[in-house]
């Protein structure tokens, strides 16, 4: 189950981060890994593995840790200062337009096209027209050519916004 809010979504107007970590708020803000108490007088630690906060903040609660869905692998666990990092399993990818699920990468390019990019956790294989070199629009044809691709190795983790 993915959290629906990130601290970026909730971020108040930016203020300079206080330099010293203290148990009471500094300039009205609590350090990463904490949230502010109901009366605004204390900084309360987030619960490791359950919730987190990434920035100096005056949030009244910490944000829920993301749980990686089936079809995803956990690249790094949730800490009090950083959300879980999930990544699509090999052979699948997550598109910006449909970030809620990992989709299977195509196994090959349509007729008249050549593969120029591998399947990665954040992109499908990339196909271009043999002659023009222009990219394929993305719709998967009913019948694919036998040009196949092996799943690409991840270059860098795609961090879920939660």
């Amino acid at each position: 189950e993915s959290a629906l809010i990130t601290q970026q979504d909730l971020a108040p107007q930016q203020r300079a981060a206080p330099q010293q970590k203290r148990s009471s708020p500094s300039e009205g803000l609590c350090p990463p890994g904490h949230h502010i108490s109901e009366d605004g007088r204390d900084c309360i630690s987030c619960k490791y593995g359950q919730d987190y906060s990434t920035h100096w903040n005056d949030l009244l609660f910490c944000l829920r840790c993301t749980r990686c869905d089936s079809g995803e692998v956990e690249l790094s666990p949730c800490t009090t200062t950083r959300n879980t990092v999930c990544q699509c399993e090999e052979g699948t990818f997550r598109e910006e337009d449909s970030p809620e699920m990992c989709r299977k990468c195509r196994t090959g390019c349509p007729r008249g096209m050549v593969k120029v990019g591998d399947c990665t956790p954040w992109s499908d294989i990339e196909c271009v027209h043999k002659e023009s070199g222009t990219k394929h629009s993305g719709e998967v044809p009913a019948v694919e050519e036998t040009v196949t691709s092996s799943p690409g190795t991840p270059a860098s983790p795609c961090s879920l916004s939660g």
Epitope: L4, I5, D9, L10, P12, S24, P25, E27, G28, I36, E38, D39, G40, R41, D51, N57, D58, L59, L60, F61, R64
Partner: antibody, heavy 122, light 112 residues
Framework: EVQLVQSGAEVKKPGASVKVSCKAS????????MNWMKQSPGMSLEWIGR????????FYNQKFKGKATLTVDKSTSTAYMELSSLRSEDTAVYFC???????????????WGQGTLVTVSS | DIVMTQSPLSLPVTPGEPASISCRSS???????????LHWYLQKPGQSPQLLIY???NRFSGVPDRFSGSGSGTDFTLKISRVEAEDVGVYYC?????????FGPGTKVEIK
């Protein structure tokens, strides 16, 4: 347009319970606290408590603990307040109102429901 | 709990004239973060309250600039520079510096 639409007036007998609803629209329901206020006839306002739809935490005014129970149904963006063991002094107009998730801006209410009159009478 | 008092409790006004409402708190509303969490609402007849001013002097969006808030510590004032007929209703001050948040008794503004 942000709107909070509350359920209609209720008449209840002493000892009964009542559940008032507040349907939110025009904003992300899980992005704000939902607060509840009591306004007794000809009287001022009292803050009852608030519900956090994001993590389902509640925070009550000590005075209303045991009297009010706050819940939400995220699938319909509706907040509820149940009042139990009703007495004549619970007769009031009850308002829902939203507030921000931050301490610095969380203590005032930018949008309010139209109010629900609860009358307790034998 | 913090007790909020308002004066006057009733204020007859003349359209076009200024009006002023006072609000006092039983303790200072200056938070340890140096902000003051004192807010003003107007409840027009038959309506729900609407936010006018937050944190002493900040006008909420859409609130006419004839409304202004001032004050510090325990003493606060809401001023209407030129009262209009639509300004009638009950004005409440409210504090969120101390839990639980509390409201004043209200000041009823009506046209003379």
């Amino acid at each position: 347009e942000v709107q909070l639409v509350q359920s209609g007036a209720e008449v209840k007998k002493p000892g009964a319970s009542v559940k008032v609803s507040c349907k939110a629209s025009g904003y992300s329901f899980i992005g704000y606290f939902m607060n509840w206020m009591k306004q007794s006839p000809g009287m001022s306002l009292e803050w009852i408590g608030r519900f956090n739809p994001y993590n389902e935490d509640t925070f009550y005014n000590q005075k209303f603990k045991g009297k009010a129970t706050l819940t939400v149904d995220k699938s319909t963006s509706t907040a509820y307040m149940e009042l139990s063991s009703l007495r004549s002094e619970d007769t009031a107009v009850y308002f829902c109102a939203r507030s921000a998730y931050y301490f610095d801006s969380g203590g005032y209410f930018d949008y309010w429901g139209q109010g629900t009159l609860v009358t307790v009478s034998s | 709990d913090i007790v909020m008092t308002q004066s006057p409790l009733s204020l007859p006004v003349t359209p076009g004239e200024p009006a002023s409402i006072s609000c006092r708190s039983s303790q200072s509303l200056v938070h340890s973060n140096e902000n003051t969490y004192l807010h003003w609402y107007l409840q027009k007849p038959g309506q729900s309250p609407q936010l006018l001013i937050y944190k002493v002097s900040n006008r909420f969006s859409g609130v006419p600039d004839r409304f202004s808030g001032s004050g510090s510590g325990t003493d606060f004032t809401l001023k209407i520079s030129r009262v209009e007929a639509e300004d009638v209703g009950v004005y409440y001050c409210s504090q969120s510096t101390h839990v639980p948040w509390t409201f004043g008794p209200g000041t009823k503004v009506e046209i003379k």
